[in-house]
Amino acid sequence: KKVVLGKKGDTVELTCTASQKKSIQFHWKNSNQTKILGNQGSFLTKGPSKLNDRVDSRRSLWDQGNFTLIIKNLKIEDSDTYICEVGDQKEEVQLLVFGLTANSDTHLLQGQSLTLTLESPPGSSPSVQCRSPRGKNIQGGKTLSVSQLELQDSGTWTCTVLQNQKKVEFKIDIVVLAFQKASSIVYKKEGEQVEFSFPLAFTVEKLTGSGELWWQAERASSSKSWITFDLKNKEVSVKRVTQDPKLQMGKKLPLHLTLPQALPQYAGSGNLTLALEAKTGKLHQEVNLVVMRATQLQKNLTCEVWGPTSPKLMLSLKLENKEAKVSKREKAVWVLNPEAGMWQCLLSDSGQVLLESNIKVLPTWSTPVQP
């Protein structure tokens, strides 16, 4: 018996070939012997089966002795043995129809689980293997699960259903809802304007939800909500904002926040959360602000940084075009009795400068100038 695999919703063509290469009488029946389709001369006739409105045949091939049964918009319950009777020949074809669907939704939040469920006819014992857009393979039976979805899992999943050494392939588009970056860090000199951007890693027609930025300043004992906002069809509207600092927010995506001035008291870490309509869970992006200040008080030139810096970062004070006078893996460095000239305070990571602040030290009889 020939086995043919079909996909739910697709069209399948079952073939039946007569030994004589001419148009003769034929009919297709199911396992209950119910007539599905046949011919009367050059006319196509349909039987009383439940497939009535979904079957057809290629009439152009009849006179070559080919009598196809075309079944459109396949359903799992179309799985059956189909019998073609043509002349004194009888051919049997077993059709197995499979469907593969993603749990509830194909738009899932980063960190959530994806479950792919195989619909299969009774009595079948298929195996399924799926490949993610980053090439990861998973294997299973009637269900396949991937826990902790990552951003790279967004895209087309290719799944192969194997049954009786035959295969049918499904492609499912999965969208992982997440910010492009899990975390970002902004380095600013005191007084500079700060821009925070939170680009999304996906695009959808309509995007509705609400969000909030909580901030834990390094100098503060507890975190506080800096801003809350709504998102309606990709339009952003601010609901509530603190008075200090008075953040400004862009009205369009990507989510964009502006802090008028970088000040030591604002240095710290923030967590922007976005709750999307009809989705359980929230999207998160961490943002960090590091602020630098260079000052001269009497005979002491000091450079300080505030905010979440890694222990491997180097803070240095140097006179322009000269070797560093002081370099430490600390958050403050100073030079006593600095000589006159343009001093540079540098925060660097393995030689790469992340932040720089210049301060002009005047001869001792005058006051310092901060450019």
Epitope: N137, T156, K167
Partner: antibody, heavy 117, light 107 residues
Framework: EVQLVQSGAEVKKPGESLKISCKGS????????IGWVRQMPGKGLEWMGI????????TYSPSFQGQVTISADKSISTAYLQWSSLKASDTAMYYC??????????WGQGTLVTVSS | DIQMTQSPSSLSASVGDRVTITCRAS??????LAWYQQKPEKAPKSLIY???SLQSGVPSRFSGSGSGTDFTLTISSLQPEDFATYYC?????????FGQGTKLEIK
């Protein structure tokens, strides 16, 4: 019987363009990925990338991204590998293979590409 | 990228010998490993998939084992037609990568 038949050997000059082919038969060409593998003279196998002829979805190895283009014409069950400007270092044997979710179960006979001035 | 390291690079053996080739992945690849055989001037041929499943038509003297990072290909009793180069390949994540090959020669 599953078969992948590749186009014949090519001798080209540096800077020239080239498109080699791989024709599949004996199976549903649109239902499997097709991969390309490079083997430089006396060396091992290198995975270049794959294409799904059903919708021309492609994935490249970072080493070959931008160096070659993989395409397919499902109407004639043929996959292609092409270069816009060949280099001497492109001299190699190129194989196409049917990709069964990562495993290359059937291979073409290979196309030898020689680039020399 | 996941690096695949085969050992030994070459191996001399006699007909009837039992031979083992190993393949190590730079990170865990579950059982997503294939073994191929390549004879001079020929295309590679698939022998083993999913680390231990024998491709249809491949003689049962070939077997594969392992999971995670360490894998082996064993030929229980070498036949004259088995002298060739063998490659392992991971297909756990893109880009799928091959080992550098093990050349099996007649002693």
């Amino acid at each position: 019987e599953v078969q992948l038949v590749q186009s014949g050997a090519e001798v080209k000059k540096p800077g020239e363009s080239l498109k080699i082919s791989c024709k599949g038969s004996g199976y549903s060409f649109t239902g499997y990925w097709i991969g390309w593998v490079r083997q430089m003279p006396g060396k091992g196998l290198e995975w270049m990338g794959i294409i799904y002829p059903g919708d021309s979805d492609t994935t490249y190895s970072p080493s070959f991204q931008g160096q070659v283009t993989i395409s397919a014409d499902k109407s004639i069950s043929t996959a292609y590998l092409q270069w816009s400007s060949l280099k001497a270092s492109d001299t190699a044997m190129y194989y196409c293979a049917r990709d069964q979710l990562g495993l290359f179960d059937y291979w073409g006979q290979g196309t030898l590409v020689t680039v020399s001035s | 990228d996941i690096q695949m390291t085969q050992s030994p690079s070459s191996l001399s053996a006699s007909v009837g010998d039992r031979v083992t080739i190993t393949c190590r992945a730079s990170q865990g690849i579950s059982s997503w490993l294939a073994w191929y055989q390549q004879k001079p001037e020929k295309a590679p041929k698939s022998l083993i998939y999913s680390a231990s499943s024998l491709q249809s038509g491949v003689p049962s003297r070939f077997s594969g084992s392992g999971s995670g990072t360490d894998f082996t290909l064993t030929i229980s009793s070498l036949q004259p037609e088995d002298f060739a180069t063998y490659y392992c390949q991971q297909y756990d994540s893109y880009p799928y990568t091959f080992g550098q090959g093990t050349k099996l020669e007649i002693k």
